[in-house]
Amino acid sequence: QEDEDGDYEELVLALRSEEDGLAEAPEHGTTATFHRCAKDPWRLPGTYVVVLKEETHLSQSERTARRLQAQAARRGYLTKILHVFHGLLPGFLVKMSGDLLELALKLPHVDYIEEDSSVFAQSIPWNLERITPPRYRADEYQPPDGGSLVEVYLLDTSIQSDHREIEGRVMVTDFENVPEEDGTRFHRQASKCDSHGTHLAGVVSGRDAGVAKGASMRSLRVLNCQGKGTVSGTLIGLEFIRKSQLVQPVGPLVVLLPLAGGYSRVLNAACQRLARAGVVLVTAAGNFRDDACLYSPASAPEVITVGATNAQDQPVTLGTLGTNFGRCVDLFAPGEDIIGASSDCSTCFVSQSGTSQAAAHVAGIAAMMLSAEPELTLAELRQRLIHFSAKDVINEAWFPEDQRVLTPNLVAALPPSTHGAGWQLFCRTVWSAHSGPTRMATAVARCAPDEELLSCSSFSRSGKRRGERMEAQGGKLVCRAHNAFGGEGVYAIARCCLLPQANCSVHTAPPAEASMGTRVHCHQQGHVLTGCSSHWEVEDLGTHKPPVLRPRGQPNQCVGHREASIHASCCHAPGLECKVKEHGIPAPQEQVTVACEEGWTLTGCSALPGTSHVLGAYAVDNTCVVRSRDVSTTGSTSEGAVTAVAICCRSRHLAQASQELQ
């Protein structure tokens, strides 16, 4: 999902040293940056979140806020400190003139400042049928575990807490941070104010139409009667949850954020902090029929982002718009005509649609999974959600062509049994943001902190790329793809897996001088090959070089073009075994695939040879896909020959551990 590559407006205000000496220059002369929402109508100028550097203490935050007020007053400006953040992010929320931004950016400890902006509710009984495995009957939906050990926080509108569907299941906290409703004649009708939140609480834990009927919920009001809130209000809500967690630690926590605004660095950062504190965050992808990476919190990598599908497993259309899509979406879930509690009366039901409803389904599934296995980490939960999803059921033609390959074809489902999945080696595919077209442009894909990067591949629609490599960054391996001259840009594709007690390293062989090609193998005792990457400096690998075939009986070896450097991902983990599986097609073909058998998990996906007519390779679930240029544009048959190389692994250690538990 989105990291620092967000498509939002960043204004860097240069520091001028001739300022009257009242502000200390930030340490090391670093320039604090200013951010604002790229969607103009959603901007809320006049209110700013001042984010301070990570180690800043509360007392320093308060001092910085006071200093800003004092300096503003000297210039004849009134300011109001609305909130001082601590517990999640250090900083403060200030109401002030935009004229003071330059001054504020020079304050000590300031990391960046973000103008406040709006967030919105994302809504307009086949749903339980879809997520229920075949062995349960949806008309007598009896979840294996109702999620009773889990607390789900809902950040939404007010809710009708004594509705028959949710009475006794939802604790309404005293948290409220909402903007005034728009329009002078707006009439606050209670049932309308409660509509969105009541419905979603019902979808998560409703007595008759809920996914996790045993889950208890806590509601925070961050959306007003029109379903509108602010980034700052949502931040304060997330901070409230973190403080509650610290004061009274309970079991697993799920936070449902059925809202979306424009890309927000600060909202994403807060979500990251909360996720790293062990909280599972689930959010709506957004209802804008657009790339989810342009919205927050949907674009936060640590958040489970959910798109919406209908009863036919097709992407939901909502008027002229519809569900968001793209690489920032983790999976889809039912989100059209979802029956749930209606705030019109205490026993009423209504159907609502949107990615909010889809996210509520996933929050419910997550609650049930966590109730069955309370020790699951966020990475483990995400991998399980992906693993148990219905695969390849969505008609991708609904998505824009350039987004189809990036959008996961997954519809959330309950596991057939909430126990016993521990033996599985779980992997997922993570796409980077697009590199951009410049000659030296690169794209980076990263795994979650407790996932292992087991392989790295790249993809370019033009075919002009210079491969990919795994490299260390901040003590962790990342996957970096390189654009080539004249290329329209590349994607890096990381294969991220859950491999406890793994010790992985990358072995590199420089380009070979001889014509036999470049080779590299895992030479350390007990290390097995999990992935192969190749990277080249030349603009165009010779297209007439014959493909290099791997010598038989050498599964622990990566081979590639003689002008490329080859990188082998080698891992040692208890009971880990891997094998190479190839599928070569002599005639030109736009797509070649090879899949791992039942019980094995795809960890590596690459193409042989790495010549320029190969657009790239990527993993889709347990299948390795190699894409080539349009057949009509490729030359000779020999040049068109492509082999898809899959590395399939399994963990005997995990399987044994699972059997011992059963």
Epitope: D139, E140, Q142, Q160, S161, D162, R164, E167, G168, V170, M171, V172, A190, S191, D194, G214, D344, C345, S346, T347, C348, F349
Partner: antibody, heavy 115, light 116 residues
């Protein structure tokens, strides 16, 4: 602990009205509505209706519709049930119960309608 | 709306077991039913909720482990093991039906359990 404490017994003449109170404690009052159920001497239970403690919405049984009014006072966590135009067959013990779950009940209020 | 039928009387010896039945009318086999205990001269007390999968949610406050429920087809059963004198009570079953303005709660006639 959760408690529902009802007002004392009442003796009323036919055609009169009665108002029974039910004071809740030990839980968040607005998280559960209040159900009202009555039991005529030697008979089974009969549901009369429900009121939302959150927004005051009501749901009345058809048999008493038009004669019953249910209200709440959130400041005192108290629910009220008023029955008008009393008849002899309204003689019963009137119970309040917590929410639709009806997991906690009041001790009951005997209302005797007699001329 | 469903009709709930209960036998008027049941009896069991001290220390024995007894199963009380509440039968839903045809077409309502998926309905949840609540069981209530009403000791002589007292108000009803929630025992637990039951559907075809067994108990729904948790038992009422102070209900001993000797009480259990089962559901099958149109029948909802309340079983009391190792019967004690304090179990001598009327036992009522109830069910919710409908939504919106059509919502009603129906009760069975009650079963009087005598401990011998």
């Amino acid at each position: 602990q959760v408690q529902l404490v009802q007002s004392g017994a009442e003796v009323k003449k036919p055609g009169a009205s009665v108002k029974v109170s039910c004071k809740a404690s030990g839980y968040t009052f607005t998280s559960y509505g209040i159900s009202w159920v009555r039991q005529a001497p030697g008979q089974g239970l009969e549901w009369m209706g429900w009121i939302s403690t959150y927004n005051g919405n009501t749901n009345y049984a058809q048999k008493v519709q038009g004669r019953v009014t249910m209200t709440t006072d959130t400041s005192t966590s108290t629910a009220y049930m008023e029955l008008r135009s009393l008849r002899s067959d309204d003689t019963a013990v009137y119970y309040c119960a917590r929410g639709y779950t009806r997991d906690y009940w009041g001790q009951g209020t005997l209302v005797t309608v007699s001329s | 709306q469903p009709v709930l039928t209960q036998p008027l009387f049941a009896s069991a010896s001290l220390g024995a077991s007894v199963t009380l039945t509440c039968t839903l009318s045809s077409g309502y086999s998926s309905y949840e039913v609540d069981w209530y205990q009403q000791r002589p001269g007292k108000g009803p007390r929630f025992v637990m909720r039951v559907d075809t999968g067994g108990i729904v949610g948790s038992k009422g406050e102070g209900i001993p482990d000797r009480f259990s429920v089962l559901g099958s087809g149109l029948n909802r059963y309340l079983t009391i093991k190792n019967i004690q004198e304090e179990d001598e009570s009327d036992y009522h079953c109830g069910a919710d039906h409908g939504s919106g303005t059509n919502f009603v709660v129906v009760f069975g006639g009650g079963t009087k359990l005598t401990v011998l």
